[in-house]
């Protein structure tokens, strides 16, 4: 089932996520002047089992001016992650799979991809909100939204977040990233798909967010 709408818009807030539930699809979109190779996949699909999730298929773009003679081949995300691990042994290195079981990480970029990514999400996908620069959060409850299936219909829960422009300092408040808990989500409910752009991507964040150490500068 498709989620009927995009996640709720909160004034002066942005949302993002770091993991995608199995079943999520990502369209293979190419930037202007490029197109998918004829034999290429239409989308990537987050699949897996109880211990490992990864993106199936790979997106490949080629110049619209050529007739598929020069394919732009990009490694699959799992291959990309594995390659990076061997090159740089550091705790910064992303693992091959998402922190949460049954979830995929954000796929790395592919050659000549479009700026915006179009995702199709499944029921249970969470989105976490943050106030944009110049605004601070007033929490009434969880600053998150989840696609749920209720009585055969899908809906996005309303995040309990208000962003106010009264910034006391130029530094971001030490907001915490919500603890993503696999429990309590409609895992058993029917899958729901929704289309939205990457500027409205949905994800889950598994780790507690540390206090922001950044200050802001506008150009």
């Amino acid at each position: 089932e498709l989620c009927d709408d995009d996640p709720p818009e909160i004034p002066h807030a942005t949302f993002k996520a770091m993991a995608y539930k199995e079943g999520t699809m990502l369209n293979c979109e190419c930037k202007r002047g490029f197109r998918r190779i004829k034999s290429g996949s239409l989308y990537m699909l987050c699949t897996g089992n109880s211990s490992h999730s990864s993106w199936d298929n790979q997106c490949q773009c080629t110049s619209s001016a050529t007739r598929n003679t020069t394919k732009q081949v990009t490694p699959q995300p799992e291959e990309q992650k594995e390659r990076k691990t061997t090159e740089m042994q550091s705790p910064m290195q992303p693992v091959d799979q998402a922190s949460l079981p049954g979830h995929c990480r954000e796929p790395p970029p592919w050659e000549n991809e479009a700026t915006e990514r179009i995702y199709h999400f499944v029921v249970g996908q969470m989105v976490y909100y943050q106030c944009v620069q110049g605004y601070r959060a007033l929490h009434r409850g969880p600053a998150e939204s989840v696609c749920k299936m209720t009585h055969g219909k899908t809906r996005w829960t309303q995040p309990q977040l208000i962003c106010t422009g009264e910034m006391e300092t130029s530094q971001f408040p030490g907001e915490e990233k919500p603890q993503a808990s696999p429990e309590g989500r409609p895992e058993s409910e029917t899958s729901c798909l929704v289309t939205t752009t990457d500027f409205q991507i949905q994800t889950e964040m598994a780790a507690t967010m540390e206090t922001s150490i950044f200050t802001t500068e506008y150009q």
Partner: nanobody, 130 residues
Framework: QLQLVESGGGLVQTGGSLRLSCSTS????????IGWFRQAPGKEPEGVSY????????YYADSVKGRFTISSDNAKNTVYLHMNSLKPDDAAVYYC???????????????????????WGKGTLVTVSS
Amino acid sequence: QLQLVESGGGLVQTGGSLRLSCSTSGFTFDGYAIGWFRQAPGKEPEGVSYITGSDGSTYYADSVKGRFTISSDNAKNTVYLHMNSLKPDDAAVYYCAIDRLGSGGAYVPIWWRSSDMDLWGKGTLVTVSS
């Protein structure tokens, strides 16, 4: 294979300057925050700075604010980190990384976490002698 390539590291005396570069080919920075982490031996990675590909907003860690400047050359698909008044504490391996922007093309500093990046460079070593 898509990758981020850093350059510009080296040995510099305290108070000196360096300019690090992070370049790529095959994709544009439009949909990403692009910037730098650093890691000294035995220490946790530290977010240093980033710039957004959407509107060029820049962000800095308190430890480098006023000394480091990040900039980008979209025509060259390159991001630069200008490091002035370097201190021994700045010595580390500097890694370039990217992360997708949030909804509306926005990005907030609290997302700039080493565990969440989408793509990494191999790193470039910066040594500051006293």
